[in-house]
């Protein structure tokens, strides 16, 4: 007799995990045999899907391989064309160890900002998520929060939050990790010790020191009057993220000094700046009084006669002092290039010393002149022809500009170092030496005056000139 | 030799003025720098002034505005005016060669401020 | 101004010792371009004008016995008279010229 299909196995509740067999039995009493169809959330399987296998006239349902996204309400509809089609349905859940979908990755950020570092994940049951810094687990606080998604929030980022962070997905099933990524926190640049301001004597040696930190540890610069330091030494050294830096400075004239610290963060730059001011005691007085200043020597033709950073006065009666007194130089000095090899290192140290007079500390920065004694022995014994020679040119009036006169002194109007040896300037390229061979007689060729010793004073009456006339 | 001869100290009330005059002799006098330093009884030397080659004066705190400095190359002759002398300035009163040491003295000369 | 301290204020000695004067400047006397020191000592016996024994802190003056030497820098100076004679009783000053020029106090020497 025909009989009406009845469902005696109802579809139940079906957990699989991804990858495994899922199957779903919907047995069927009915005469004639019915057809029996599948439906996953009310859309028909169709019988040729390769992922499904449909068996036992219909009443076996087999998913091969599941995937996450097979998780649904599956039906079984059982017609035979006797009373009315019949329907059971059952859930597939499919179970899933944690999987981390959207891991977090490196991130830099700016102290004070927030910082998000994202872990999406999946899995079922619904994994939970922890993070790990360094080795321990991380402690959430009033600043730290992991989100809903498992995302790691922290605001107001601060140094000691930078460091290695890994997310943790975790469920009944298993657990997942995800790679070690770097929170880098960058600190703009900020100045823990700014310079200080000096009132220092003329001539002196002065040291500022800046300090500064950041993230990246910062550079600094050194700005005088506005401009990066010409001249000076800088000393620098990093520890602990800190960094020293000393300027050393000889004092010729006063200046603001400005430290400016300085870092990058992408493309763009973090700067802070402290300043210091070093005046000179009674400063104006060398320029009132004593028609010109003291200055280092920045010039190039006395260079190699002339003592590393020598102060040396330049005349204010010219307009630019510098300019003036080097064309004055340079115009002597090419004259000098036909002399003998005897008389040019002499006359050379003799004419950048005269020029550009050494300057003296006292009361008042004062240039000192050359001593008479080496004056007299670039004329009277190194360069006895040659000045000769131009003194007679000199009376026939051979020379078109006096510029090359004022190069050259007046021996007798230059102080003796024999009644005070701290009067004048001794030109060192001149001095005795009793290991050097090229020794010279004592001059004779004219008769000093009563207040012109021999040179040198005590130690020997012979002169010499550095080996192969050296004037480095 | 160089020598060095002071004169024109004495006895001057406070409030007074003197003027002392050293003659150099035996060096160059126009080429050199000059100064004035003086000795209280009993007590430590005190620098205060000096004149450089182009007679530009530079002086001690102490006596600055009171007491001037002065050359006279053709002389060689070295001055100092001392005014509104007070009774603390009373010293022995030394002529002094020298730029950066003080390389040549004089024997001195007497000045008390007493009334 | 710049301030010499000098000690002791007096020493006595017996003819052949040796003799250490010190010196200190309230700020260093060294001039950066020269790099010399910018300090003297002098010598004045009783009843007589000082003299110059050594300048730039080391340089002894002509004339001036070999005893006498003078070593030091930046702040600290000594003169040191390495085998005293009778008419070395004196007193001895230091005095710096790096600026306006100031004296020490002064050591009185007296020979035993």
């Known amino acids: 007799l025909p009989k009406a299909p009845v469902i005696t196995t109802p579809l139940e509740t079906v957990d699989a995990l991804v990858e495994e067999v899922a199957t779903f039995m919907c047995a069927v009493e009915s005469y004639p045999q019915p057809e029996i169809s599948w439906t996953r959330n009310k859309i028909l399987i169709k019988l040729f899907d390769t992922r499904y296998s449909i068996r036992e006239n219909g009443q076996l349902l087999t998913i091969l391989s599941v995937e996450d996204s097979d998780d649904g309400i599956y039906c079984c509809t059982a017609n035979n064309g006797v009373g009315g089609a019949v329907e059971s349905c059952g859930a597939l859940q499919v179970k899933m160890k944690p999987k981390i979908t959207r891991p977090p990755i490196n991130v830099k950020i700016i102290e004070g900002l927030k910082a998000v570092l994202p872990c999406t994940t999946m899995g079922n049951p619904k994994p939970s998520v922890s993070w790990i810094k360094g080795d321990s687990p991380l402690r959430e606080n009033s600043r730290t929060a992991v989100l809903e998604s498992g995302s790691l929030r922290i605001h107001n980022v601060q140094k000691e939050d930078a460091g290695q962070y890994r997310c943790v997905a975790k469920n009944s099933l298993g657990t997942a990790y995800s790679k070690v990524v770097k929170l880098e926190v960058e600190v703009f640049a900020r100045i823990l010790r700014a310079p200080e301001s000096h009132n220092v004597t003329f001539g002196s040696f002065v040291t500022l020191h800046c300090t500064a930190t950041g993230i990246p540890v910062p550079t600094i610069t050194w700005i005088e009057n506005g401009n990066a330091v010409s001249s000076g030494s800088i000393q620098e050294s990093v520890k602990d993220r800190v960094i020293d830096s000393r300027l050393q400075l000889f004092i010729t004239k006063p200046g603001l000094y400005t430290c400016i610290a300085t870092n990058k963060h992408g493309e763009k730059f973090s700067t802070a700046k402290a300043a210091a001011t070093v005046s000179i005691a009674e400063w104006s007085k060398p320029q009132k009084d004593n028609k010109g200043y003291c200055a280092q020597y920045r010039g190039e033709v006395c260079n190699a006669v002339l003592a590393k950073d020598a102060l040396v006065f330049l005349n204010t009666s010219y307009a630019d002092p510098e300019e003036a007194q080097e064309l004055l130089v340079h115009t002597a000095w090419n004259e000098l290039k036909v002399v003998s090899p005897l008389c040019r290192p002499a006359a050379e140290a003799l004419l950048c010393n005269h020029v550009f007079q050494e300057c003296s500390p006292g009361v008042v920065p004062t240039p000192i002149p050359i001593c008479r004694e080496y004056c007299l022995a670039v004329k009277e014994l190194f360069c006895a022809k040659e000045w000769l020679a131009m003194e007679e040119k000199t009376h026939r009036g051979l020379y078109r500009s006096e510029m090359h006169l004022l190069s050259v002194p007046e021996c007798s109007k230059l102080p003796s170092m024999h009644w005070d040896p701290t009067a004048c300037a001794r030109l060192p390229h001149l001095d005795y030496n009793k290991e050097n061979p090229k020794t010279f007689p004592p001059m004779t060729s004219s008769k000093p005056s009563v207040d012109i010793p021999n040179l040198p004073s005590s130690s020997s009456s012979s002169f010499s000139v550095s080996p192969t006339y050296s004037m480095t | 030799e160089v020598q060095l001869v002071e004169s024109g100290g004495g006895l001057v009330q406070p409030g007074g003025s003197l003027s002392l005059s050293c003659v150099a002799s035996?060096?160059?006098?126009?080429?050199?720098?000059m100064n004035w330093v003086r000795q209280a009884p009993g007590k430590g030397l005190e620098w205060l002034s000096v004149?450089?080659?182009?007679?530009?004066?530079y002086y001690a705190d102490s006596v600055k505005g009171r007491f001037t400095i002065s050359r006279d190359n053709v002389k060689n002759t070295l001055y100092l005016q001392l005014n509104n002398l007070k009774p603390e300035d009373t010293a022995l009163y030394y002529c002094v060669l020298g730029r950066t040491a003080l390389v040549r003295w004089g024997q001195g000369t007497q000045v008390t401020v007493s009334s | 101004d710049i301030v010499m301290t000098q000690s002791p204020s007096s020493v006595t000695a017996s003819v052949g010792e040796k003799v250490t004067i010190n010196c200190k400047s309230s700020?260093?006397?060294?001039?950066?371009?020269?790099?010399?020191?910018?300090l003297n000592w002098y010598q004045q016996r009783p009843g007589q004008s000082p003299r110059l024994l050594i300048y730039?802190?080391?340089t002894q003056e002509s004339g001036i016995p070999d005893r006498f030497s003078g070593s030091g820098s930046t702040t600290d100076f000594t003169l040191t008279i390495s085998s005293v004679q009778p008419e070395d009783a004196a007193v001895y000053y230091c005095q710096q010229a790096y600026s306006a020029p100031t004296f020490g106090s002064g050591t009185r020497l007296e020979i035993k």
């Open positions: 730039y802190a080391s």
């Open positions: 004149i450089d080659t182009h007679s530009i004066a």
């Open positions: 700020q260093s006397v060294v001039f950066g371009s020269n790099q010399k020191s910018y």
């Open positions: 035996g060096f160059t006098f126009s080429l050199y720098y």
